[in-house]
Interface confidence: medium
């Protein structure tokens, strides 16, 4: 049998006749910034080119004994996980290693920066195909390291990093906290977050997804045929770097935004036991375990969206929180969430020529989060239509009046400290799906988009009696772009999207009472793109879709038990 | 990449008195900021990344680095430029005393300065 981690990232089998074995990442170069490596290990021999880059600090301690096998241990294992002959994810990928960590696994921010600059210069001197950079390291939050990662990402490089092994918020570490980097947490064979001694995988909004990171069999630097089991978020990041290499080899033109959306889309959803995470981090942490796509083509027709949480606003009365999408993504909706329920809603606003989602704290509130729904929508033209608070008892409403524009999201923002629950709930009149409705004392913001073939519909789920959570999901083939609550009353803590489900959270039932005033409706806006579907069908007509996971059929034969040399 | 525009002592002579050297505020009235690792044991004081504003050219980076060295030397401090960045971020890596940070933050083109810190295999 193949190792559990490789099985876990392999999608369920499709019919054999739909598949052609892929090249396993052969068009992609993966740069590894780590310790030195044992490049003549049979797992990676001929697959890894050791560059002359080395920038490491002196080892600590006067009695430190430099032993080659220990110096090479971390990097060799990771190179094996990415592209190893037997236990690797992307067996066709070629790698280049840079030494930025010493024999004790320690490096510096400055050394890492110079390494990233080296990669950029190499890319300019000799442009090759897609580049993936694996950063299986972490330090404290660093503005300069994050900035360098941002620049490299904007130059078209895919950066994958370890979330960190500190059982802490990944946003406190770098490069994990850099938004442009794909940050990976670690899970085990039971889909539990990985515990490492007294610590474990990092978590929180800066993590993009999780991947296998416990008891991972890979190349050992003890001998050229040895294998060893290692654990950590580095191993998890190496899996995602391998998956990214496979995806980019199949579709070399994928942008970073497209790759990230695909990684999220093809991940296993809601399999992680969230009880392991601190309570306040559960809602922020993505419940996603990375997996290879079932086939190399056929994903193009989908409208991909992801949820981006802001940092916490902090408790001051006028505090705000801002959530942003990546440069290539469109902000299709904006919502907010506060654990105390004291918030003043959210609005979409332009910042630097791009829409952002801003949430507002309220007096006595412990702070808010802004939640952006970020989507890939080529040739989109989106704008925000705003209606000021209405005096009429019917409430405030706004719709998309431009021809060809469809409603993708609704936001509401109010200046009053407490909207109160005494007003009757406002219901949307039937037959007017293209409008947002809200409380009469709130201003309402509609996100209206025009894109080829884009169509959207509104889906609601109302519960008359108060409940802590109301959800509504988009059906197969449709993608959730907007998620909001109707009406925006004070007992609603907020709304946010989890995958294709809109979640509206309310205050604890016991504190709300069970009157009709507690009624809450979750409103989902579900969209799809007929244009993307059509383009994809045309593409599939001329290209036979080849499957990514056939490589693992061959691998089942390749994998031999006698390679297991545990230490 | 080698340091281009000659040695910097001539710059020292060109500057005015000991006091007025680099006290001028950076352009646009914006103040450069200093950052360091929140985790104290991971800090590496004595080595700093001086990040310059986005459109700064390599020659300006080198000039700014030499200017810092000249100013530092006049105050009895040694500085060593370990690297000049270009390609990703403009700036330079410098080994110097933390006493010089205030001076360095006032250099023209400086966006922010970050103290070096450790990173670890995960």
């Amino acid at each position: 049998s193949i190792p559990w981690n490789l099985e876990r990232i392999t999608p369920p089998r499709y019919r054999a006749d739909e598949y052609q074995p892929p090249d396993g990442g052969s068009l992609v170069e993966v740069y590894l910034l780590d310790t030195s490596i044992q490049s003549d290990h049979r797992e990676i021999e001929g697959r890894v080119m050791v560059t002359d880059f080395e920038n490491v600090p002196e080892e600590d301690g006067t009695r430190f004994h430099r032993q080659a096998s220990k110096c090479d241990s971390h990097g060799t294992h990771l190179a094996g996980v990415v592209s190893g002959r037997d236990a690797g994810v992307a067996k066709g990928a070629s790698m280049r290693s840079l030494r930025v960590l010493n024999c004790q696994g320690k490096g510096t921010v400055s050394g890492t920066l110079i390494g990233l600059e080296f990669i950029r210069k190499s890319q300019l001197v000799q442009p090759v195909g897609p580049l993936v950079v694996l950063l299986p390291l972490a330090g404290g939050y660093s503005r300069v390291l994050n900035a360098a990662c941002q620049r490299l990402a904007r130059a078209g490089v895919v950066l994958v990093t370890a979330a960190g092994n500190f059982r802490d918020d990944a946003c406190l570490y770098s490069p994990a906290s850099a938004p442009e980097v794909i940050t990976v947490g670690a899970t085990n064979a039971q889909d539990q977050p990985v515990t490492l001694g007294t610590l474990g995988t990092n978590f929180g909004r800066c993590v993009d997804l999780f991947a296998p990171g416990e008891d991972i069999i890979g190349a050992s630097s003890d001998c050229s045929t040895c294998f060893v089991s290692q654990s950590g978020t580095s191993q998890a990041a190496a899996h995602v770097a391998g998956i990214a290499a496979m995806m980019l080899s199949a579709e070399p033109e994928l942008t970073l935004a497209e790759l990230r959306q695909r990684l999220i889309h093809f991940s296993a959803k809601d399999v992680i036991n969230e009880a392991w995470f601190p309570e306040d981090q559960r809602v922020l942490t993505p419940n996603l375990v990375a997996a290879l796509p079932p086939s190399t083509h056929g994903a193009g027709w989908q409208l991909f969206c992801r949820t981006v949480w802001s940092a916490h606003s902090g408790p001051t009365r006028m505090a705000t929180a801002v959530a942003r999408c990546a440069p290539d993504e469109e902000l299709l909706s904006c919502s907010s969430f506060s654990r105390s329920g004291k918030r003043r809603g959210e609005r979409m606003e332009a910042q630097g020529g791009k829409l952002v989602c801003r949430a507002h704290n309220a007096f006595g509130g412990e702070g808010v989060y802004a939640i952006a729904r970020c989507c890939l929508l080529p040739q989109a033209n989106c704008s925000v239509h705003t209606a000021p608070p209405a005096e009429a008892s019917m409430g405030t409403r706004v719709h998309c009046h431009q021809q060809g524009h469809v409603l993708t999201g609704c936001s509401s923002h109010w200046e009053v400290e407490d909207l109160g629950t005494h007003k009757p709930p406002v219901l949307r009149p039937r037959g007017q799906p293209n409008q947002c409705v809200g409380h009469r004392e709130a201003s309402i913001h509609a996100s209206c988009c025009h894109a080829p073939g884009l169509e959207c519909k509104v889906k609601e789920h109302g519960i008359p009696a108060p409940q802590e959570q109301v959800t509504v999901a988009c059906e197969e083939g449709w993608t959730l772009t907007g998620c909001s609550a109707l009406p925006g009353t004070s007992h609603v803590l907020g709304a946010y999207a989890v995958d294709n489900t809109c979640v509206v959270r309310s205050r604890d039932v016991s504190t709300t009472g069970s009157t009709s005033e507690g009624a809450v409706t979750a409103v989902a806006i579900c969209c799809r793109s007929r244009h993307l579907a059509q383009a994809s069908q045309e593409l599939q007509g001329s290209t036979s879709g080849s499957g990514l996971n056939d490589i693992f059929e061959a691998q089942k034969i390749e994998w031999h038990e006698h390679h297991h040399h545990h230490h | 990449q080698e340091d281009e525009d000659g040695d910097y002592e001539e710059l020292v002579l060109a500057l005015r008195s000991e006091e007025d050297g680099l006290a001028e505020a950076p352009e646009h009235g914006t103040t450069a900021t200093f950052h360091r690792c929140a985790k104290d044991p991971w800090r590496l004081p004595g080595t700093y990344v001086v990040v310059l504003k986005e459109e700064t050219h390599l020659s300006q980076s080198e000039r700014t680095a030499r200017r810092l060295q000249a100013q530092a030397a006049r105050r009895g401090y040694l500085t060593k430029i370990l690297h000049v960045f270009h390609g990703l971020l403009p700036g330079f890596l410098v080994k110097m005393s933390g006493d010089l940070l205030e001076l360095a933050l006032k250099l023209p083109h400086v966006d922010y300065i970050e103290e070096d810190s450790s990173v670890f295999a995960q």
Epitope: - | Y8, E9, L78, L82, L93
Partner: antibody, heavy 121, light 107 residues
Framework: QVQLVQSGAEVKKPGASVKVSCKAS????????IHWVRQAPGQGLEWMGY????????KFNQKFKDRVTMTRDTSISTAYMELSRLRSDDTAVYYC??????????????WGQGTTVTVSS | DIVMTQSPSSLSASVGDRVTITCKAS??????VAWYQQKPGKSPKLLIY???NRYTGVPSRFSGSGSGTDFTLTISSLQPEDFATYFC?????????FGGGTKVEIK
């Protein structure tokens, strides 16, 4: 122990180039700058420049700037100094030295044994 | 360039003598001065750094002083192994420069 071992003596003709190597051991090569200093027969010491092995950043004495190249190979912990367009007055012993820096204290704490370069027609 | 003028260029002394060598910088180099000892056919060895700090393993008879432009190396009681050439170096400004050297010979 910490040491710098240089390549052997060289005899060159005027106009030729010479490349001297300096192999470091007993410490992390990329952690310290390597300087090159020369000493003509019966003369004093003359600083030529330095390389930061961790980033390849170099700084030269203006006197040698157009003729000197400093490189390194981290895989074998070796620094190189190449001097081109040799003249007879380049006949000297060439030393590499490691520079230690801590606080505001700087010095050359380890020196290579020296490489004699003779330029003669 | 900063010129380091070392004097005397040579001196003769006996074992047990107190020997003083001076170095004058053409401009302020603060305390960024090191002193080295060199024996014939050998590479220089560090004695003093930052004008007055004795390097590890250097006998206590060697001491340094000075700041700004005037620096002194003192050997309090000359020993047979101390007969050599001594150089000062400034590290305040590029290019680093050395004094011309002082040869200490047996009287």
């Amino acid at each position: 122990q910490v040491q710098l071992v240089q390549s052997g003596a060289e005899v060159k003709k005027p106009g030729a180039s010479v490349k001297v190597s300096c192999k470091a051991s007993g410490y992390t090569f990329t952690g310290y700058t390597i300087h090159w200093v020369r000493q003509a027969p019966g003369q004093g010491l003359e600083w030529m420049g330095y390389i930061n092995p961790s980033s390849t950043y170099t700084k030269f004495n203006q006197k040698f700037k157009d003729r000197v190249t400093m490189t390194r190979d981290t895989s074998i912990s070796t620094a190189y100094m190449e001097l081109s367009r040799l003249r007879s007055d380049d006949t000297a012993v060439y030393y590499c030295a490691r520079e230690r820096i801590y606080s505001n204290y700087w010095f050359f704490d380890v020196w290579g044994q020296g490489t004699t370069v003779t330029v003669s027609s | 360039d900063i010129v380091m003028t070392q004097s005397p260029s040579s001196l003769s002394a006996s074992v047990g003598d107190r020997v003083t060598i001076t170095c004058k910088a053409s401009q302020n180099v603060y305390t960024a001065v090191a002193w080295y000892q060199q024996k014939p056919g050998k590479s220089p060895k560090l004695l003093i750094y930052s004008a007055s700090n004795r390097y590890t393993g250097v006998p206590s008879r060697f001491s340094g002083s000075g700041s700004g432009t005037d620096f002194t190396l003192t050997i309090s009681s000359l020993q047979p192994e101390d007969f050599a050439t001594y150089f000062c170096q400034q590290l305040s400004s590029y290019p680093y420069t050395f004094g011309g050297g002082t040869k200490v010979e047996i009287k």
